[in-house]
């Protein structure tokens, strides 16, 4: 014999104050004929929550149209949830009777408890920049959630990280909880455009996790490589020397030219370009006057990057007799 079943699929329903709670109840049979009522609690002291036929329930609405003869969905919505609404809710089928209906079957019940959403995760990186191949730590914090169960994951550019430690406080019973996690990330030279993401999943978020991000550009320093070259052509009695500062980050850079140990104050032409990986290249041109008296000129390009110790590259100028004798026209 087939028999009516009352389906209340959720054993526990977590709701937040002020929101609307949906309590699901469906039946597997239209028989026996009779209404379905909602109660909170069991026994003689149970509280009637909804009765379609009689009473006034301003905060309760039905999900489906109960006037439909073939309706099997008796789910309800309770609006403006308060802490007073917590408890176990039962949908109960009554069999039509005379003089009054008789209780036929009850659903297993859904416990409604208050939940609190976690705050948006805040991700903080290291206080100082670090060079590639070193490890940096990022912290992620989220507060104010309940219940205590929560899942936290770390990602770098979409790839899940495994080197992290997480704590949820307090360990005992509480109205709300906090989570703090520290992830260790090894920096790569191309990480200027990278991101670390802290993802928090909680039952109150209904499958839509919260994310906090931090840009590795705030944590990384990519030191430059220097190259000083002498251009093969000259203009009149001047030789063009180039200092190429490659692949550095951040942009903060000071470049000075020295001629035989003496810092040159005069203006030099320069260009700054950005690479695809977010690092920068800086090219500076320095014009050196050639005369018969100046056979050995040593040029130094010195770079101070992001407040670090200066690095420099030297070039001993090669000025051939042939170059000295040429006219003032530009020659290859």
């Amino acid at each position: 014999e087939e028999e009516l079943q009352m389906i209340q699929p959720e054993k526990l329903l977590l709701v937040t104050v002020g929101k609307t709670a949906t309590l699901h109840c469906t039946v597997t049979s239209l028989l026996p004929v009779g209404p379905v009522l909602w109660f909170r609690g069991v026994g003689p002291g149970r509280e009637l929550i909804y009765n379609q036929k009689e009473g006034h329930f301003p905060r309760v609405t039905t999900v489906s149209d109960l006037t439909k003869r073939n309706n099997m969905d008796f789910s309800i919505r309770i609006s403006s949830i308060t802490p007073a609404d917590v408890g176990t809710y039962y949908c109960v089928k009554f069999r039509k009777g005379s003089p009054e209906n008789v209780e036929f079957k009850s659903g297993p019940g859904t416990e409604m408890a208050l939940g609190a959403k976690p705050s948006a995760p805040v991700v903080l990186g290291p206080a100082a920049r670090t060079t590639p191949e070193h490890t940096v730590s990022f912290t992620c914090e989220s507060h104010g959630f309940s219940p205590r169960d929560i899942t936290l994951k770390w990602f770098k550019n979409g790839n899940e990280l495994s080197d992290f430690q997480t704590n949820v406080d307090p360990t005992g019973q509480s109205v709300a909880y906090s989570i703090r996690s520290t992830a260790r990330v090894v920096l790569d030279p191309w990480d200027v455009r990278s991101q670390v993401i802290c993802e928090v999943a909680h039952v109150t978020l209904q499958g839509d996790p919260l994310r906090g991000t931090a840009n590795l550009s705030e944590a990384i320093r990519v030191p430059p490589t220097l190259e000083v070259t002498q251009q093969p052509m000259r203009v009149g009695n001047q030789v063009n020397v180039t200092c190429q500062v490659r692949k550095f980050y951040p942009q903060s850079l000071q470049l000075t030219w020295s001629e035989n140990g003496n810092v040159c104050q005069r203006e030099t032409a320069s260009t700054l370009t950005e690479n695809k990986d977010g690092t920068y290249n800086w090219t500076s041109w320095f014009l050196v006057n050639i005369s018969d008296q100046r056979d050995d000129v040593v040029l130094t390009c010195q770079v101070k990057h992001d407040g670090q110790l200066a690095v420099s590259k030297r070039l001993a100028l090669e000025v051939t007799v042939h170059q000295k004798d040429q006219s003032s026209d530009a020659t290859p």
Partner: antibody, heavy 119, light 107 residues
Framework: QVQLQESGPGLVKPSQTLSLTCTVS??????????WSWIRQHPGKGLEWIGY???????YYNPSLKSRVTISVDTSKNQFSLKLSSVTAADTAVYYC???????????WGQGTTVTVSS | DIQMTQSPSSLSASVGDRVTITCQAS??????LNWYQQKPGKAPKLLIY???NLATGVPSRFSGSGSGTDFTFTISSLQPEDIATYYC?????????FGGGTKVEIK
């Protein structure tokens, strides 16, 4: 008036998942309280009800298929869908989507789509 | 599951004849029963709902009756366009189940 149109691949390989979509036109899938059903008919045989989804998002699946069936609804696209996993040749059938409206009975049906399970 | 037994499985009648199909439920389903018509290569069409109510746009020659476990579907005067297979369906209990069908042909 409301019309239904099934769509999806006509050929599915054994052990794969059969995926069909039913597009509702001429009305909103979320208005009223209809049940949105899937029914199938094996070649030369009778009708077999697969399951339904309705207003509250509740689904009920025929126990004979329950472990393999998922019915879902996308209100933004005015569509509901059927997924049947681990198919075999025995799942070869014409698949219909249908609506049960205010009155009992499935009063609106799609024209049906033939699905063959074969390698 | 509720078993729906339909009889006969097929019948042949002349135009103008009265045609009767029966459907028996394995247990009491009150009047939670529908009747459908399916023409070859087409989707089923709802004819009768709640055992005896005529669906919108359905000719009055079709009718239904019964309650509990025994139900009857009648075509008072068979027409050529009524060539089809007819199915009963119960919706008192989940899962919904159909009868095996009755194929109606013209003599």
């Amino acid at each position: 008036q409301v019309q239904l149109q099934e769509s999806g691949p006509g050929l599915v390989k054994p052990s794969q998942t059969l995926s069909l979509t039913c597009t509702v036109s001429g009305g909103s899938i979320s208005s009223g309280s209809p049940y949105w059903s899937w029914i199938r008919q094996h070649p030369g045989k009778g009708l077999e009800w697969i399951g339904y989804i309705y207003a509250s998002g509740f689904t009920y699946y025929n126990p004979s298929l329950k472990s393999r069936v998922t019915i879902s609804v996308d209100t933004s696209k005015n569509q509901f869908s059927l997924k049947l996993s681990s198919v075999t040749a025995a799942d070869t059938a014409v698949y219909y989507c249908a609506r049960e409206g205010y009155h009992s009975g499935m009063d609106v049906w799609g024209q049906g789509t033939t699905v063959t399970v074969s390698s | 599951d509720i078993q729906m037994t339909q009889s006969p499985s097929s019948l042949s009648a002349s135009v103008g004849d009265r045609v009767t199909i029966t459907c028996q439920a394995s247990q009491d389903i009150s009047n939670y029963l529908n009747w459908y018509q399916q023409k070859p290569g087409k989707a089923p069409k709802l004819l009768i709902y709640d055992a005896s109510n005529l669906a919108t746009g359905v000719p009055s020659r079709f009718s239904g009756s019964g309650s509990g476990t025994d139900f009857t579907f009648t075509i008072s005067s068979l027409q050529p366009e009524d060539i089809a297979t007819y199915y009963c369906q119960q919706f008192a209990y989940l899962p919904w189940t159909f009868g095996g069908g009755t194929k109606v042909e013209i003599k």
